[in-house]
């Protein structure tokens, strides 16, 4: 299955959203920083595609959950929130297309179970992080920023997947 | 191949929450990427979609319902949940639980076969 | 959210005929994101077709699916007795997840 050109795009839309949510300077909360300790290994080119599929979607799925609670609600510009929860749901579509195209609807794609456990504890990090912070301005910005960087390092795998067509 | 039981009060009176509990068998509700779903059918009516929670966490729900529904995964017991705030007759439906493929959020292949839920005062 | 309109509410064949439910939706469901199940008395469920064309594991190849956009048809090419029943069609590609009214296939 190819991924669309315009996943491609949501993906750009994605990032360049979360560059506008920001709020206060990353310089400013020097001190809140955090090594949330992004499990880059399991986005490494290595993967075939059908495994790299259901990393990307923990991935997307996890982002969407973490940026659509009540905390996340009152930390955020709600336009820019609304515009976010669009790509993000525009991407799980395009990777349930690939799904529905290469498999049978009562077989169960190459599961990566431990690639999955590991972006899922990535999160948990993140939320724990946040729970101990208060969920202050400064933790979600740098939040914000970790997001930022962790996604687009994902973002990255999807073009060099495409490049291996 | 994975299974669900619905299982819940079967008579209710208005203003009550409604819990129901689907347990799954043949399949754990925590691993993978599935999402769990909650569907209702008032008596000879059609289907309505309520809600489902990913294994992973997080939950979507219908915006007709949002504010008076919950989902919730127990891991331990291998169950998914449905509760439904201040119930009134519209609420009497087969509640049904479903799970679909992996990654995929809206189709519904497996089928708990439903369990009656009335709201009569 | 998009409105599945299903037609006719009422279809009555025989045995042996052929069967073209339709469902249309009030805007483009996104990637063929559709799917249809067949009800039949104090059943769950049961999925036919998802992604608007492909038949699930199991279903007999006299069901067939197609459409895309906003217009999608089921096709049963030759009427068994146990083909009998409701028939919803769904969309899975923008929350809320929607159903059509169903349509009752019965003996004529």
């Known amino acids: 299955c190819d991924l669309p050109q315009t996943h491609s795009l949501g993906s750009r839309r994605t990032l360049m959203l979360l560059a506008q949510m920001r709020r206060i300077s990353l310089f400013s909360c020097l001190k809140d920083r955090h090594d949330f300790g992004f499990p880059q290994e399991e986005f490494g080119n290595q993967f075939q595609k059908a495994e790299t599929i259901p990393v990307l979607h923990e991935m997307i799925q996890q982002i969407f959950n973490l940026f659509s609670t009540k905390d996340s609600s009152a930390a955020w510009d709600e336009t820019l929130l609304d515009k976010f929860y669009t790509e993000l749901y525009q991407q799980l579509n395009d990777l349930e297309a690939c799904v529905i195209q290469g498999v049978g609807v009562t077989e169960t794609p190459l599961m990566k179970e431990d690639s999955i456990l590991a972006v899922r504890k990535y999160f948990q990090r993140i939320t724990l992080y946040l729970k101990e912070k208060k969920y202050s301005p400064c933790a979600w910005e740098v939040v914000r920023a970790e997001i930022m960087r962790s996604f687009s390092l994902s973002t990255n795998l999807q073009e060099s997947l495409r490049s291996k067509e | 191949q994975v299974q669900l039981q619905e299982s819940g009060p079967g008579l209710m009176k208005p203003s009550e929450t409604l819990s129901l509990t689907c347990t799954v068998s043949g399949g754990s509700v925590s691993s993978g990427s599935y999402y769990w779903s909650w569907i209702r059918q008032p008596p000879g009516m059609g289907l309505e979609w309520i809600g489902y929670i990913y294994s992973g966490g997080g939950a979507n729900y219908n915006p007709s319902l949002k504010s008076r529904v919950t989902i919730s995964v127990d891991t331990s017991k291998n169950q998914f949940s449905l509760k439904l705030n201040s119930v009134t007759a519209a609420d009497t439906a087969v509640y049904f639980c479903a799970r679909g493929i992996p990654m995929v959020r809206g189709i519904l292949h497996y089928w708990g076969q439903g369990t009656l839920v009335t709201v009569s005062s | 959210e998009i409105v599945l309109t299903q037609s006719p509410g009422t279809l009555s064949l025989s045995p042996g005929e052929r069967a073209t439910l339709s469902c249309r939706a009030s805007?483009?469901?996104?990637?063929?994101?559709l799917a249809w199940y067949q009800q039949k008395p104090g059943q769950a469920p049961r999925l036919l077709i998802y992604?608007?064309?492909s038949r699930a594991t199991g279903i007999p190849d006299r069901f067939s699916g197609s459409g895309s956009g906003t217009d999608f048809t089921l096709t049963i090419s030759r009427l068994e007795p146990e083909d009998f029943a409701v028939y919803y069609c769904?969309?899975?590609?923008?929350?809320?997840?929607?159903f059509g009214q169903g349509t009752k296939l019965e003996i004529k």
């Open positions: 992604g608007a064309s």
């Open positions: 805007q483009s469901v996104s990637s063929s994101f």
């Open positions: 769904q969309q899975y590609g923008s929350s809320p997840y929607t």
